[in-house]
């Protein structure tokens, strides 16, 4: 674009520039090219010799230009159109410049430190001095002439006339600049051009509110010497929470988000949540709803699956396994991750549920007790006599952490019915002798319940390293027995296991190994009150 | 607001000369880049154009009529005038008065017209 | 002389139709100085001729923006969007890039 220094037509008031002498150029009204009034200066002492008539405009402030455009629009009289004239007559006029740092004021051109530049010598357009049928003289002759580079603050034209007839119709002064813009989110600053001779003026852009470049490397464009943009370079990107809207970002709206600036547009809210604000950059779930940490913004949110579905058990008793199957959860939660926990408790026999204990570090879950993503497990190292409750529940990646003992599980309670119900470290050694040994156990049936008095106890003993094919048998129906004729400084190994009425003996195994050393002959005998 | 009026002698005989005034309001002949001229349109034709006269008293005339027309003004009556010598019936039409626009030669206001008639 | 023809003699058209009229010219029009110098006029029946356009696209001051002209070199074209009752009578185009002027020989718009 040109930014204007000075329009002559821009003016209806009187122009008021400097004429030396006062008989040369003269102000008058007129028309333009579109009949508008305007104010001109004329000058057309073509019959009298050796005239040197100045006019010089008022100061222009060359505001950031350097290299300032100057155009004139005129009419040039042929000298052969005007009878007696010949001799003296001219077809031309000069135009020049000065440089000041402030307005000379009404005084001579010629005054005021420095000489006037001549910027070049001004003839009509060839056509105009052929026509002799007076159509020259309506067709505005149009000049443009470059000064410059200029240094100092502003300058006055001047135009010297030395015999022409001419009208001097408008006079405009400017310079070229790249207009203010904005481009790839980027504004860029009005900027003067260079000449037509130099390089591109490189202007770095600004983003444009709520937008961002890429880190050090601004979005630069060129200004060229036409006053055109060119080359741009590079471009900014809407904000996180904003999308682009043609030259300017907007804030995403309620419903919308976007997560991050390289994407352009603003996203829906994904399923099960919301943004209720402008310029969201995430979208908040819906209450019993969320996102696991490794879920992107884009995800939908989900929410914790229902229980397992149809949970069914088999309980083989020799050895002693729980087996266990179920179906996957009708409400997945809108996840694929689900993966299934166990959790194991041992209850009394009798009683309200709560009087449970998880079952310790014994019981053995295969293929192990959390994170399955099968639907079925096996619990091992289970006691005989004993009622376990198993839980599985169903967890996906936004399960709490304590969701496995919350609400979304299933549940089944076993009874392992008699047997032998002991860990190793529950049987004691009351009493070792060179020939003897003693041990108690505690009852697998309370005292006092149905069934505890009808339990019987078998007791399988050899001697550690012979076959175990060549055991002895003892029996006993209290929860104690006392082992003779054995071989002193000899290792035993024990096994014990009880049957009530119901099931044969057969149908019960062994608990584990114990291992008891008779003592020495010399040695005298101990009562040992603490369990192996 | 501009206005042009044509006066003429409404019927002359051939060989004679014609003489029209314009009288105009509105501007001022003096300013730089007025001009005024003379247009005809025999009844039922086109328009011919004929001669302009300029602010600084610069004529133009149309070549085929050149030798019979003479423009000139009084810049302080604000009137235009135009003679045409050796009139012929050929001559008979209506003839407008019009301010020519600002350097491009069009005409931008034109008189109401003067009838002239040419005949024995 | 430069010889200018409008076609058509005739344009019968509707009211809030759009009309065309074609400006040929035998020479080009455009000036040494750039500009091209063709108008156009119209008049309406007993009365003096009126500017529309000046220098081929250039609306004369309180004409309706209905009317606008287009063209270059030889060829030009004024063009009405919807005609009105007033819009009736003879238009002519006129070019004065060359001594003499001339005008066309007029487009008569009339009601079909």
């Known amino acids: 674009e040109e930014v204007i220094l000075l329009d002559s037509k821009a003016s209806q008031a009187e122009l008021g520039w400097t004429a030396l002498p006062s008989n040369g150029w003269e102000e008058i009204s007129g028309v333009d090219e579109h009949d508008r009034p305007i104010r001109t200066y004329q000058v057309c002492n073509v019959l009298e010799p050796n005239q040197d008539n100045w006019l010089q405009t008022g100061w222009i402030s060359r505001g950031r230009g350097q290299r300032i455009f100057v155009e004139l629009q005129f009419t040039l009289r042929d000298c052969s159109s005007i009878p007696g004239a010949a001799g003296t007559c001219k077809e031309t006029f000069n135009v020049y410049y000065l440089e000041t740092e402030a307005d000379l004021g009404r005084g001579r051109p010629r005054l005021g430190g420095s000489r006037p530049r001549k910027i070049d010598t001004i003839a009509a357009d060839e056509s105009f001095t052929q026509g002799d049928l007076g159509e020259r003289k309506m067709k505005l002759n149009t000049e443009v002439r470059e000064i410059g580079p200029l240094s100092r603050r502003g300058f006055h034209l001047a135009f010297q006339d030395v015999g022409a007839c001419v009208a001097l119709v408008s006079v405009r002064v400017y310079y070229k600049q790249c207009r203010a813009t904005v481009r790839g989110l980027a504004t860029f600053p009005a900027t003067a051009a260079e000449s037509a001779f130099s390089t591109l003026v490189e202007v770095a852009g600004t983003c444009v509110a709520h937008s961002e470049g890429e880190p050090g490397s601004p979005p630069r464009m060129h200004c060229g010497a036409d006053g055109e943009w060119l080359v741009p370079v590079g471009r900014c990107s809407c904000s996180a929470g904003f999308q682009e809207r043609g030259d300017f970002c907007e804030a995403c709206p309620p419903g919308f988000y976007k997560v991050s600036p390289r994407r352009p547009l603003c996203s829906p809210c994904p399923e099960h949540s919301r943004a209720l604000e402008n310029a969201s950059t995430f979208c908040v779930c819906q209450d019993s709803y969320a996102r696991s940490p490794t879920d992107p913004p884009s995800a939908s949110c989900t929410r914790p699956p229902s229980a397992p579905r149809d949970l069914q058990y088999s309980l083989s008793r020799s050895p002693l396994v729980l087996r266990l199957r179920w179906l996957p959860p009708a409400d997945s939660g809108g996840r694929s991750d689900v993966t299934y926990s166990l959790l194991c408790l041992r209850c009394g026999r009798e009683g309200p549920a709560g009087a449970c204990e998880p079952c310790g570090p014994r019981v053995a879950f295969l293929p192990r007790q959390a994170g399955l993503r099968e639907r079925a497990a096996t619990l091992l190292h289970l006691r005989p006599g004993a009622r376990y409750t198993v839980r599985v529940a169903a967890l996906n990646g936004v399960s709490g952490p304590a969701a496995a003992a919350g609400t979304t599980y299933a549940q089944v309670t076993v009874s392992t019915g008699p047997g032998a119900p002991w860990e190793e470290d529950e049987i004691r050694r009351d009493r070792v002798e060179p020939q003897s040994v003693s041990l108690s156990w505690r009852e697998p049936i309370p005292a006092g319940a149905p069934g505890a008095n009808d339990t019987e106890y078998e007791i399988r003993y050899y001697e550690k390293g012979q076959s175990e094919q060549t055991y002895s048998m003892v029996k006993t129906g209290a929860p104690t027995v006392t082992v003779t004729n054995l071989k002193p400084a000899t290792r035993y190994v024990f096994q014990i296991r009880a049957a009530s009425p119901g099931p044969s003996w057969e149908a019960q195994s062994f608990n584990p190994s114990i291992e008891v050393q008779t003592l020495g002959e010399a040695a005298s005998g101990s009562r040992d009150q603490s369990p192996a | 607001q501009v206005t042009l009026k044509e006066s003429g002698p409404g019927i002359l005989q051939p060989s004679q000369t014609l003489s029209l005034t314009c009288s105009f309001s509105g501007f001022s002949l003096s300013s730089s880049g007025m001009g005024v001229g003379w247009i005809r349109q025999p009844s039922g034709k086109s328009l011919e154009w004929l001669a302009n006269i300029w602010w600084d008293d610069d004529k133009s005339y149309n070549p085929a009529l050149k030798s019979r027309l003479t423009i000139s003004k009084d810049n302080s009556r604000n009137q235009v005038f135009l003679k045409i010598a050796n009139v012929d019936t050929a001559d008979t039409a209506t003839y407008y008065c019009?301010?020519?626009?600002?350097?491009?030669?069009?005409?931008?206001?034109w008189g109401q017209g003067t009838l002239v008639t040419v005949s024995t | 002389d430069v010889v200018v023809t409008q076609t058509p003699l005739s344009l019968p058209v509707s009211l809030g139709d759009q009309a065309s009229i074609s400006c040929r010219s035998s020479?080009?029009?455009?000036?040494?100085?750039?500009?091209?110098?063709l108008h156009w006029y119209l008049q309406k029946p007993g009365q003096s001729p009126k500017l529309l356009i000046y220098?081929?696209?250039n609306r004369f001051s309180g004409v309706p923006d209905r009317f606008s002209g287009s063209g270059s070199g030889t060829d030009f074209t004024l063009k009405i969007s919807r005609v009105e009752a007033e819009d009736l009578g003879v238009y002519f185009c006129?070019?004065?890039?060359?001594?003499?002027?001339?005008f066309g020989g007029g487009t008569k718009l009339e009601i079909k």
């Open positions: 019009v301010r020519v626009g600002g350097y491009g030669d069009y005409f931008a206001y």
């Open positions: 020479q080009s029009l455009v000036h040494s100085n750039g500009n091209t110098y």
């Open positions: 006129s070019q004065s890039t060359h001594v003499p002027y001339t």
């Open positions: 220098k081929v696209s």
